[in-house]
Interface confidence: medium
């Protein structure tokens, strides 16, 4: 069962999944100037059996410029910087992936993919939040959100996290000395 909504948004925070439940879909989105190859599926799907899961299909993008043009589309410095970030994230994500039954790990990257990955999560999926650079985390509870089914409708639980700038007041109302806990997740673009 697909989750109806996106996970909750938290100011100055991003979220990501450590592993993706079977049934999760990832759109094959391409960056500007590129489109999905004609024969390509519009998404990758996490599928599997009782013991192993993997992404079915593979995303590929091709230049959307006319075929007979000789002008090459070269990534602009900004695009190159964005791709570099994604590459570093991939390395970090792949380095410490654990194999969870019924889950796929972070999908492989693809050439000229869009800078933001759009996921369609399923019930039971957990996503983890961390504060963006320059902000620190104040936790009331777990910095995670789970897609749950209640009364036939899907909803995401509310993560107990506030991200505060170094100069801002660092306490929840009515609390004394909150402990800023270290963020254990690699930095990531927001997934949807």
């Amino acid at each position: 069962e697909l989750c109806d909504d996106d996970p909750p948004k938290i100011t100055h925070a991003t979220f990501k999944a450590v592993a993706y439940k079977e049934g999760t879909m990832l759109n094959c989105e391409c960056k500007r100037g590129f489109r999905r190859i004609k024969s390509g599926s519009p998404y990758m799907l996490c599928t599997g059996n009782s013991s192993h899961s993997s992404w079915d299909n593979q995303c590929q993008c091709t230049s959307s410029a006319a075929r007979n043009t000789t002008k090459q589309v070269t990534p602009q410095p900004e695009e190159q910087k964005e791709r570099k970030t994604t590459e570093m994230q991939s390395q970090m994500q792949l380095a410490d992936q654990v194999s969870l039954p019924g889950h796929c790990r972070e999908p492989p990257p693809w050439e000229n993919e869009a800078t933001e990955r759009i996921y369609h999560f399923v019930v039971g999926q957990t996503v983890y939040y961390q504060c963006v650079q320059g902000y620190r985390a104040l936790h009331r509870g777990p910095a995670e959100s789970v897609c749950k089914m209640t009364h036939g409708k899907t909803r995401w639980t509310q993560p107990q996290l506030i991200c505060t700038g170094e100069t801002e007041p660092s306490q929840f109302p009515g609390e004394e000395e909150p402990q800023a806990s270290p963020d254990g997740l690699p930095e990531s673009e927001t997934s949807r």
Partner: antibody
Framework: QVRLQQSGPELVKPGASVQMSCKAS????????INWVKQRPGQGLEWIAW????????YFNENFKDKATLSVDKFSSTAFMLLSSLTSEDSAVYFC???????????????WGTGTTVTVSS | QIVLSQSPAILSASPGEKVTMTCRAS?????IHWYQQKPGSSPKPWIY???NLASGVPGRFSGSGSGTSYSLTVSRVEAEDAATYYC???????FGGGTELELK
């Protein structure tokens, strides 16, 4: 030691089918993608398809969708490729190759099989 | 679909010479891999993600490039380097036509 051992040479008639195998050893077979690559005599390399042995997911080069069928036997750690409706164009050496995308997130063929020679002749 | 063109098709060199072969992509790509193949043998991984040498590859080999142009360089060619070298796009798995390095 990681190895991919492929089956022996095949001489087949036009229109027939042939199945070749690729036996993996030295690693967890179900954790890596197995790719198949074609090389015609004196020619370059052409990627055919991959299969993920853990669950049988496959992904094909469009040019081979109607030509090749991939399967695996997890118990013997063996991947198979069946080629059908053979013509002289299918005469080639076929390699299996293990792929990983752990090299900085990039797909990479890190171990190659010994190759199976297929000759199509009447 | 990305097309990779390798040049030259045949590269003749004397031992100790520096040689460079190129791989051009039909549109910009972020990385390519290189494989070495000797007659009658399977291809071997040689350079991955543009510039990283595979295990056991001598340090005289190097890879570089970006966008649509990539190259493999041998700083001082040795007899054992005689082989065909193929570039491959990391995502579509397309291979170039190969460059045969032969020794004079």
């Amino acid at each position: 030691q990681v190895r991919l051992q492929q089956s022996g040479p095949e001489l087949v008639k036009p229109g027939a089918s042939v199945q070749m195998s690729c036996k993996a050893s030295g690693y967890t077979f179900t954790d890596y993608y197995i790719n198949w690559v074609k090389q015609r005599p004196g020619q370059g390399l052409e990627w055919i398809a991959w299969i993920f042995p853990g669950n049988g997911n496959t992904y094909f080069n469009e040019n081979f969708k109607d030509k090749a069928t991939l399967s695996v036997d997890k118990f013997s750690s063996t991947a198979f490729m069946l080629l059908s409706s053979l013509t002289s164009e299918d005469s080639a050496v076929y390699f299996c190759a293990r792929a990983t995308y752990d090299h900085g997130g990039y797909w990479y063929f890190d171990v190659w099989g010994t190759g199976t020679t297929v000759t199509v002749s009447s | 679909q990305i097309v990779l063109s390798q040049s030259p098709a045949i590269l003749s060199a004397s031992p100790g010479e520096k040689v460079t072969m190129t791989c051009r992509a039909s549109s910009s790509v972020s990385h390519i891999h290189w494989y070495q193949q000797k007659p009658g043998s399977s291809p071997k991984p040689w350079i991955y993600a543009t510039s990283n040498l595979a295990s056991g590859v001598p340090g005289r080999f190097s890879g570089s490039g970006s966008g649509t142009s990539y190259s493999l360089t041998v700083s001082r060619v040795e007899a054992e380097d005689a082989a065909t070298y193929y570039c491959q796009h990391w995502n579509s798995f397309t291979f170039g036509g190969g460059t045969e390095l032969e020794l004079k």
